[in-house]
């Protein structure tokens, strides 16, 4: 059983002799009727009228009336499309003079049921000037002096120089507030590789392959190790500044205390970690007497070494 077609709802148009025909609906597949389109609309064949067919899948064409959009005259733009007709669904590029463009940096307009979207017009847009670019040890080969918003330009570094990420060329982009960055061409010999490793410590960030001068990297020591020196290194003239040292802690073990018949004063730790410079207070175990000087019971940790007092 083939589904018949109900009365067609033709947006922006209608059937000829609509009121006479309405009582005879729904109609069988195969029937066709003449219809018209309103002003500013046309049939898919480009006429103001055509036939609409009842098919197994409903009315054909599905969109009987399509919007016509005529391309307007562009102030501050190239007018190769001026007066040309576009149909609903068609898009076209808008070519504006340098320094002008569509709003929101768009480049195309589309003919929609309601007309052009966005409206084809060329407004003053943000531009960047070549004269605002300072490039040392490199060059820009592009000939323009003014660049529109979002325009990317390439620059090249002279032999022996490279961009921050080690390449021989780079790019900058014209943004709302000017150029995205100034071109950087650094003497390859001034850059640094990854900073050096240190014993019992590590860097706090993901290390890169190449660092530009004045880059800083932070180090940290393993737990209980003490950082000596600056916790940052800086890249300068192709070399890193002196990295810090991680000084061994003193590990006070129950084994060593038992050997000397001593215990920690005021603590019951079986294992105790002390940093360089820390004072560790000991006392004799019950029933034992000091065999070393009273000062030795206030031992000082020196780079992992501690001298234990002794009790007999």
């Amino acid at each position: 059983q083939v589904k018949p077609c109900d009365f067609p709802d033709i947006k922006h148009g209608g059937l000829f002799h609509e009121n006479m025909r309405r009582p005879y609906f729904p109609v069988a597949v195969g029937k066709y009727y003449s219809y018209y389109c309103d002003e500013h609309f046309e049939t898919p064949s480009g006429s103001y009228w055509d036939y609409i067919h009842c098919t197994q899948n409903g009315w054909s064409p599905a969109v009987p009336c399509l919007r016509k959009c005529y391309f307007p005259y562009l102030e501050n733009g190239y007018n190769q499309n001026y007066g040309r007709k576009f149909v609903q669904g068609n898009s076209t590029e808008v070519a504006c003079h340098p320094g002008y463009g569509l709003p929101k940096a768009q480049t195309t307009v589309t003919c929609t049921e309601k007309g052009w979207s966005p409206t084809p017009r060329c407004i003053r847009v943000r531009t960047c000037s070549k004269s605002d670019i300072e490039i040392e040890n490199g060059f820009i080969s592009e000939s323009s002096s003014i660049y529109i918003l979002n325009k990317e330009i390439q620059y090249k570094c002279k032999p022996g120089y490279a961009t921050a990420d080690g390449n021989s060329s780079g790019s900058i982009t014209c943004l709302q507030n000017g150029w995205s960055a100034q071109p950087i061409c650094i003497n390859s010999s001034e850059k640094c590789g990854p900073p050096p490793p240190i014993s019992n410590g590590d860097t706090t960030s993901f290390l890169l392959k190449v660092y530009v001068p004045q880059s800083r990297v932070e180090y940290q020591c393993q737990p209980y190790y003490e950082l000596q020196g600056s916790n940052y290194v800086t890249c300068s003239n192709g070399e890193w500044s002196e990295p810090p040292r991680c000084i061994h802690p003193c590990i006070i073990t129950e084994e060593n205390m038992n050997k000397n018949n001593i215990k920690l004063k005021g603590r019951s730790d079986r294992k105790y970690y002390a940093k360089t410079g820390d004072t560790i207070e000991f006392m004799c175990k019950l029933g034992y007497n000091a065999n070393t000087s009273i000062l030795s019971f206030q031992a000082v940790c020196r780079e992992g070494i501690v001298e234990y007092p002794r009790c007999e």
């Epitope: 921050a164 990420d165 080690g166 390449n167 590789g193 990854p194 900073p195 050096p196 490793p197 590590d202 860097t203 993901f206 290390l207 890169l208 392959k209 190449v210 660092y211």
Partner: antibody, heavy 121, light 106 residues
Framework: QVQLQESGPGLVKPSGTLSLTCAVS?????????WSWVRQSPGKGLEWIGE???????NKKPSLKSRVIISVDKSKNQFSLKLISVNAADTAIYYC??????????????WGQGTMVTVSS | EIVMTQSPATLSVSPGERATLSCRAS??????LAWYQQKPGQAPRLLIY???TRATGIPVRFSGSGSGTQFTLTISSLQSEDFAVYYC????????FGQGTRLEIK
């Protein structure tokens, strides 16, 4: 053309140390590249373990850092991985890889063929 | 740690058709993203680096796009040798891989 070849024991006991070496041929380990270790558990995805530069600088996966030792031997043109206190979850194919020449950080363009390591008693 | 999420987990496509694989980063990785292809019993192979640059010897049917957190690998017309597992990897901050997308014959 640089080639990488992993070698090491295929079986390691639980709580033991997994030791692997990656031999670099057709190029120098002292080039401007990071030399990495990546593993793939059976039927699973890829996991980056860590990497070393010829100067001895390393990057390691934070969650594995305490168990991972990566070293480089420039005289033998090779780098090594030690993974301590292993358990069954460390059973995987272990790959060594090299990152691309170029920028500050790059993708892996050369891989070894991988070596299967099983952790079992 | 930056988490990379690939979708779909499995993609079934007929030879000659287009395949689109997605990869999302939990935070911006700029353009520091690579795509790898892995076939059973083989090591991964680099296809795309810098989000959109084809590696040496990779056919033009492979293309990458995106930046920041959203990336796409497109294979314009699938050949029989393209059916494999594909991984994305960020190398902006440490290095992490996505869980992979299996591309299978429909």
């Amino acid at each position: 053309q640089v080639q990488l070849q992993e070698s090491g024991p295929g079986l390691v006991k639980p709580s033991g140390t997994l030791s692997l070496t990656c031999a670099v041929s057709g190029g120098s380990i002292s080039s401007s590249n990071w030399w990495s270790w990546v593993r793939q558990s059976p039927g699973k995805g890829l996991e980056w373990i860590g990497e070393i530069y010829h100067t001895g600088s390393t990057n390691k996966k934070p969650s594995l850092k305490s168990r991972v030792i990566i070293s480089v031997d420039k005289s033998k043109n090779q780098f090594s991985l030690k993974l301590i206190s292993v358990n069954a979850a460390d059973t995987a194919i272990y790959y060594c890889a090299r990152d691309r020449e170029g920028g500050t950080t790059e993708a892996f363009d050369i891989w070894g063929q991988g070596t299967m390591v099983t952790v079992s008693s | 740690e930056i988490v990379m999420t690939q979708s779909p987990a499995t993609l079934s496509v007929s030879p000659g058709e287009r395949a689109t694989l997605s990869c999302r980063a939990s935070q911006s990785v700029s353009s520091n993203l690579a795509w790898y292809q892995q076939k059973p019993g083989q090591a991964p192979r680099l296809l795309i680096y810098g989000a959109s640059t084809r590696a040496t010897g990779i056919p033009v049917r492979f293309s990458g796009s995106g930046s920041g957190t959203q990336f796409t690998l497109t294979i314009s017309s699938l050949q029989s040798e393209d059916f494999a597992v594909y991984y994305c990897q960020q190398y902006d901050n440490w290095r992490t891989f996505g869980q992979g997308t299996r591309l299978e014959i429909k």
